[in-house]
């Protein structure tokens, strides 16, 4: 419970104005309603509160909304942005871009991500889905945005607006997350000529199955090292030296630099050795030559 | 189902004092803004006042302003309209409400105490 | 204060027909926060709009709100003859929480 002080005549607040700056933390507290703190929120962002201030502000705002902002004031909130918990944000309803942009902007240069990510996830509950209008939006005021919703959050992606997305506003996004968008890139991409397809295609292939790496190799795409390093070591192990060898093109020389990094450590493990050493860079660590490969693991899943 | 009940009406005298009482079921009283409201006989709805529910900030119409005091114990769900100097014109039904900040409106009200300042 | 204004004071009609209520503020409240509210003699009265045009839990259909700035309009499709009553109009953006004087619904 709150130590509660009454509001001196003299301090009494009509108006969210600029004298406020000049109220101690208790004045704050005891003079403030709520009520009007929130109907005049739009004031509040040009009033150059300090941090200890706006501590003040947002616990007034939570006695009033005990169950999560509205949006209205959610929308002018500004820089009390700054003070909100994920398990605040996780309270909010959201639907306007308006809303969202006017946020991201003000949480730009500071350490965010969790609440950021908390947001963009509301947005997309509160509307529904990741639509194209969302998505224009967080890769124009937050690229790699994307990445910090939740695989469940992004199965609602339609195909149709991957085409919007960058290779960039992938870069942070782990395997389970490129395991949703990949399927939805692929239909979205699969009437594209074969160079072109693998362009658009290259920055999801981390969520790519072993069949489609297989079907890859056939197509001279010439994979750098820096997307084959991102494919699911999964996908990856089944390929054959060959496969392998067709799918990186030129680029098969850096096997060499990354032979201690998964997933090439993992996959050269699998491999045959006199196959490895076809590929004249001296991998080393394949399966000596005459070996029997036994896979325990089909065993045990039968027993 | 929410209920709120007033009490603590009745004659006074010009210059008495009188306390009214709320008492408050079927929501959470503690997170909740309450407001009183008043009507004159024959008149139209008069804000009184509000509070809020944790640091108990008030708020009053100019024509009680210094006169009475608004009041909450959350432990009772009770809410107080303490009535001092009272006034020939204080005499009206005064209502209960609970404000829903949500819907910046009163969404449940009480069904009134009559306070009577006469001589 | 915000004052609030309504008009007509009185508005005599017939069962089912239309009733157009207007509520005009001294200065521009947010559509948010403007309320409409039904009173009937002899009782407390009874949250009908929130928001300006929200219509509040079992609130019938008939009734609508709308308006923005300092002009606010609530509005009675097919007037009932449990409509006939008291309605007023109520800000919350500022201090006083201010009422307007209420239009009397009354059966012509």
């Known amino acids: 419970d709150v130590e509660r002080t009454t509001c001196p005549p003299e301090k009494e607040v009509h108006e969210i104005d600029e004298s406020l700056i000049f109220y101690k933390k208790r004045e704050l507290e005891a003079c403030v309603d709520a009520a009007l703190l929130a109907a005049q929120m739009d004031r509040v962002d040009a009033i150059p509160f300090t941090y200890e201030q706006l501590d003040v502000l947002k616990h007034k705002l939570d006695e009033l909304y005990p169950q999560g902002y509205p949006e209205s004031v959610i929308r002018h909130l500004g820089h009390l942005f700054l003070k909100m918990s994920p398990e605040d944000i996780r309270k909010w309803n959201v639907t306007s871009l308006e809303t969202l942009k006017a946020l991201l902007k003000v949480s730009k240069g500071h350490e965010m991500s969790a609440q950021v990510a908390t947001l963009i996830d509301r947005v997309v509950v509160g509307r529904g889905q990741l639509d194209k209008d969302t998505a224009d939006t967080l890769t124009a005021f937050c690229p790699g945005c994307l990445c910090s919703l939740s695989p469940e959050r992004l199965s609602s992606v339609p195909p149709s607006i991957i085409g919007a997305v960058r290779p960039q506003d992938l870069d942070t996004c782990g395997p389970r997350q490129l395991d949703v968008l990949y399927p939805k890139a692929r239909l979205a991409f699969q009437n594209m000529s074969g160079s072109e397809y693998f362009v658009k295609i290259r920055p999801f292939l981390g969520g790519a199955p072993t069949e489609d790496l297989k079907a890859l190799s056939q197509q001279n795409v010439s994979m750098d090292l820096a997307t084959f390093m991102k494919l699911r070591r999964e996908a990856v192990l089944p390929l054959s030296v060959a496969e392998v060898q067709k799918l990186l093109g030129p680029h098969v020389e850096g096997l060499k630099v990354e032979e201690q990094h998964s997933p090439v450590r993992d996959w050269i493990l699998k491999q045959r050795q006199d196959d490895l050493d076809t590929l004249g860079l001296g991998l080393q660590g394949g399966i000596p030559n005459g070996y029997l490969i036994l896979d325990l693991s089909v065993r045990e899943a039968l027993s | 189902e929410v209920q709120l009940l007033e009490s603590g009406g009745g004659l006074v005298q010009p210059g008495g004092s009188l306390r009214l009482s709320c008492a408050a079921s079927?929501?959470?009283?503690?997170?909740?803004?309450m407001s009183w409201v008043r009507q004159a006989p024959g008149k139209g709805l008069e804000w009184v006042s509000n509070?809020?529910?944790?640091?108990?900030?008030?708020n009053y119409a100019d024509s009680v302003k210094g006169r009475f005091t608004i009041s909450r114990d959350n432990n009772k769900n009770t809410l107080y309209l303490q009535m001092n100097s009272l006034r020939a014109e204080d005499t009206a039904v005064y209502y209960c409400?609970?404000?829903?900040?949500?819907?910046?409106?009163?969404?449940?009200w009480g069904q009134g105490t009559l306070v009577t300042v006469s001589s | 204060e915000i004052v609030l204004t309504q008009s007509p004071g009185t508005l005599s009609l017939s069962p089912g027909e239309r009733a157009t209520l207007s509520c005009r503020a001294s200065?521009?409240?947010?559509?948010?926060?403007l309320a409409w509210y039904q009173q009937k003699p002899g009782q407390a009265p009874r949250l009908l709009i929130y928001?300006?045009?929200s219509r509040a839990t079992g609130i019938p259909d008939r009734f609508s709100g709308s308006g923005s700035g300092t002009d606010f309009t609530l509005t009675i499709s097919r007037l009932e003859p449990e409509d006939f009553a008291v309605y007023y109009c109520?800000?919350?953006?500022?201090?006083?929480?201010?009422f307007g004087q209420g239009t009397k619904v009354e059966i012509k």
């Open positions: 200065q521009s409240v947010s559509s948010s926060y």
């Open positions: 509070i809020s529910p944790t640091y108990s900030t008030t």
């Open positions: 409400a609970r404000y829903n900040a949500y819907h910046a409106a009163l969404d449940y």
């Open positions: 928001g300006a045009s």
């Open positions: 109520q800000q919350a953006l500022g201090y006083p929480h201010t």
């Open positions: 079927g929501f959470t009283f503690t997170h909740t803004y």
